[in-house]
């Protein structure tokens, strides 16, 4: 509603008018007029005859539109009739037996224009219509219709026929008093008081009463000829003067305040009439005779030069008895009534809804159900008036106003605001929490993905990308075949699974050879020179290699490098049937755990079993037999990174690489080369 700029009192006026004439929730009545019911055979829906006859009453259920009408709650209202007749009968417009026809189904919301209607006919052998008093199969018929229905005065006639019965009826929707418009949502109460003077048009718009104008018809049309500048009016055909002016059309000036017997040509002059003198033309010896100062029938007594005394009649006071003793001073009018003094006392003008000498009686009582939205009504003054006690979320003298704490949209990140009695709460979307859903929750914070799976935050949860050999929602299922499960290695040999091919490799103990370590290295009857020569040669080679390693070690010790940054030893010329247990790999850089990078081929990444890295072994060449009693003991595990995988597809190097995310702080990566004759374990520092 547009509101013109006005003074403070004007704003208050507009507010009151706005509360009075506004777009409201809506209010109207669905009216159902039963006309004729035919049940010629006098039978129930089950087919059983009624005894003695079908004494028929109706239950009506009005609800929201449903494509298929279900028997659920009657959301728009429900009403029952008394017994209206037996078997077949016509229903009079104003039915006897206390029932009203048409039946009234009031609603207090905007009429949606569509509806569903269920009408049931029931048989009541006696006068008790409670369900428990009826026969077990008391239903005679039930009909259900649905459709569109506009607000209007015209009745829609309908007839519904079932197997054994026929019902003729008509219905319509009309707005309640003071509600207008296509869906009874425009509230307009005609009025003729200080806050407006209008009646309501059919669409709910205002129509000003004669003599009034303005948006809310509270601006009177003044007396014709009333001076434009010097006059104004508070009611039609009136001319009230602005300060300094008087007369019927406010075109006469007012003399100076207190000017008793003088005149003016402009406001506030005081030119004395003949026989009077002084600044206010109020001085005269024969004051009472010339001036008659005493008002309201008071007796005047001269009391010396330029003075007088007034003896007042009962009910008046003041020097000139000009002040009326007002009986309204005690505020006798209640409930907002306004008090008017009269000759013989006072009179209370009561606001709408009240009457009585002091406006003490309310025209409404609890019997009128004046409390909306589930408010409970309390009688006051022996039922003369009432007070509404409102449930949470509603206020107003009749609980007509809803308290909504969600209008400021306090919930962030798409959270849904819910009114909960005296408070509100936010229902957060997945991934958010906090009082106002302002906190983002990372589902990956708990590291839910097993075996090195990569976690991705999604809007409705998380997703794990699993390394090769694992599957499941959290990478918890191992999919690779454990080739060592069948214990294929003989003679206490150690079995390793080659994860790239799901085959096994046997690490033989001393004295055994073969792919399964099944052949003992025995001494035959003839001396095996070749084998001995080979063994001695290998021993010499090992000694030489050891010396070279010691020399290299000594050279490195002389260098000023920090030992904690020492690179891992290079490895070369591995024996075909030998593998390096993970516990024998030594990382001399104790700041970092061993990480392995497999270059472009990322498909091998994943967890299988934790081979560990022993920081306690002294730095030196890697080879068979080191720390024989400790395998697979370790102090630091590689499980948090990616484990070493041991391969057998290239005999020259059975350590292959896997993928591990690089350390963001040190960028330390271990590379295991698979060139033909050399495995290189390097640490980038």
């Amino acid at each position: 509603m547009a509101a013109a700029s006005r003074s403070a009192s004007g704003w208050a006026l507009l507010l009151l008018v706005a509360l009075w004439q506004q777009r409201a929730a809506g209010s109207g009545v669905f009216q159902l007029q039963l006309q004729e019911f035919i049940n010629e055979r006098g039978v129930l829906a089950s087919g059983r005859p009624c005894e003695p006859g079908c004494r028929t009453f109706f239950r009506v259920c009005l609800k929201h539109f449903q494509a298929v009408v279900s028997p659920g709650p009657c959301t728009f209202g429900t009403v029952s009739t008394p017994v209206l007749g037996t078997n077949s009968f016509a229903v009079r417009d104003d039915s006897s037996g206390g029932g009203r026809n048409p039946l009234q189904l009031p609603f207090n919301f905007t009429w949606p224009g569509t509806f569903s209607l269920i009408i049931e006919a029931w048989h009541a052998p006696g006068d008790d219509l409670r369900p428990e008093a009826l026969p077990p199969d008391a239903l005679i018929s039930k009909i259900a219709i649905q459709g569109s229905l506009a607000v209007g005065q015209n009745w829609l006639l309908d007839e519904q026929t079932s197997t054994l019965t026929r019902l003729r009826y008509s219905y319509r929707v009309i707005c309640s008093d003071n509600y207008y418009g296509d869906n009874c949502s425009r509230l307009c109460k005609k009025r003729n008081d200080h806050f407006g003077h209008y009646v309501c048009q059919p669409d709910g718009n205002l129509s000003c009463l004669p003599g009034w104008t303005g948006e809310y018809c509270q601006q009177p049309i003044c007396l014709s000829g009333c001076h434009e500048q010097n006059g104004y009016c508070s009611k039609p055909a009136e001319c009230l003067c602005r300060p300094g002016w008087q007369g019927r059309l406010c075109n006469e000036c007012i003399p100076h305040n207190g000017c008793r017997h003088g005149t003016c040509s402009t406001p506030w002059q005081c030119t004395c009439d003949e026989g009077w003198g002084g600044l206010f033309c109020d001085q005269d010896l024969n004051y009472c005779t010339h001036h008659s100062p005493c008002k309201n029938g008071a007796t005047c007594s001269n009391s010396g030069q330029r003075s007088y005394t007034c003896t007042c009649r009962p009910g008046y006071t003041g020097v000139d008895c000009e002040l009326e003793l007002s009986e309204c001073d005690s505020n006798p009018c209640r409930n907002g009534g306004s008090c008017k003094d009269q000759e013989d006392g006072y009179h209370c003008l009561c606001p709408p809804g009240y009457y009585g000498l002091h406006c003490e009686h309310s025209t409404l009582s609890c019997a009128d159900s004046p409390c909306f939205n589930g408010g409970s009504c309390r009688e006051r003054n022996q039922g003369a008036n009432y007070a509404c006690e409102c449930p949470p979320n509603f206020t107003g003298s009749n609980c007509e106003k809803k308290v909504d704490r969600c209008t400021s949209n306090p919930c962030a990140n798409g959270g849904q605001c819910l009114n909960r009695g005296p408070s509100r709460m936010c229902r957060c979307r997945p991934g958010f929490t906090g009082t106002y859903c302002e906190l983002h929750v990372s589902d990956c914070a708990r590291n839910p993905c097993a075996h090195g799976g990569t976690c991705h935050d999604l809007e409705n949860g998380l997703m794990c990308t699993c390394p090769a050999g694992f599957s499941g929602r959290r990478c918890e299922v191992r999919t690779s075949i454990d080739a060592c499960a069948s214990s294929p290695c003989f003679n206490r040999a150690t079995c390793y699974t080659d994860l790239s091919t799901d085959t096994f490799v046997c690490n033989c103990p001393y004295g055994f050879v073969g792919s399964r370590c099944e052949f003992p290295v025995g001494l035959p009857p003839s001396f095996p020179w070749v084998a001995v020569s080979l063994g001695v040669g290998l021993a010499v080679l090992l000694v030489l290699l050891g010396m070279v390693a010691v020399a290299v070690r000594q050279l490195r010790l002389r260098r000023p490098d920090d030992g904690s940054r020492e690179a891992m030893n290079n490895l070369s010329d591995f024996q075909k049937d030998n593998l390096i247990p993970a516990a024998q790999l030594k990382n001399t850089n104790q700041k970092k755990e061993l990480e392995v990078d497999c270059g472009l081929d990322k498909s091998n990444c994943g967890k299988q079993q934790n081979h560990t890295l022993d920081y306690n072994l002294a730095p030196g060449p890697l080879g068979r037999g080191t720390m024989p009693g400790k395998f697979p003991h370790s102090d630091k595990s590689l499980g948090e990174k990616a484990p070493l995988r041991l391969h057998s597809e290239k005999p020259e190097c059975r350590i292959s690489a896997i993928c591990s995310p690089r350390d963001s702080m040190y960028q330390s990566v271990c590379l295991i080369s698979e060139e033909r004759n050399e495995c290189v374990i390097a640490t980038e520092v």
């Epitope: 829906a45 279900s70 409670r130 428990e132 008093a133 026969p135 199969d137």
Partner: antibody
Amino acid sequence: EVQLVESGGGVVQPGGSLRLSCAASGFTFGNHWMSWVRQAPGKGLEWVADISSDGRYKYYADSVKGRFTISRDNSKNTLYLQLNSLRAEDTAVYYCAKAGGGNVGFDIWGQGTMVTVSS
Amino acid sequence: SYELTQPPSVSVSPGQTASITCSADKLGTKYVSWYQQKPGQSPVLVIYQDAKRPSGIPERFSGSNSGNTATLTISGTQTMDEADYLCQSWDRSDVVFGGGTKLTVL
């Protein structure tokens, strides 16, 4: 507490008779229609008879018409079923049930009493 | 005679919705009640007048009836709901029961 307790069941020979009783408590017995419903072993429910609150109206299933009689004594809050000319197919658990009026169905049931008709 | 036809059995997983039907000619013009019966126990009324729930019956039980079919729906089925379910209506002076449907909660 609303309760229905049946009694009077037992083993009887074909052609014999029995009288079942149903004691009601916890509700105003004289205001409600009452029924008997039976259930043969391993079978579904079968309505037997019902009676109006004042005892004026009585209805029977075709399978028992002429052989069974429903009655009530509102002063004793008790419902009865007289079973005559019993047959093997009458073997069942017999339930006493309170009929909720106005097509509500049977809202209170007893625990049942077993009637076995066997030679 | 008037017969109410039910499927002998219906299976459902816990937490899922189970629907049990009851069919007869013009059944929608009559009112239907539904009963739950567990082995060795008396029947219990769970739905009356097509869709109304007696006090004490959980909200997951609901009913509907139109045309020739009435339906009992159990949403969020629990293992405790495993039982026989029987529909019931009226025909002439008779009370008519369906044959019953065994609901199995897998």
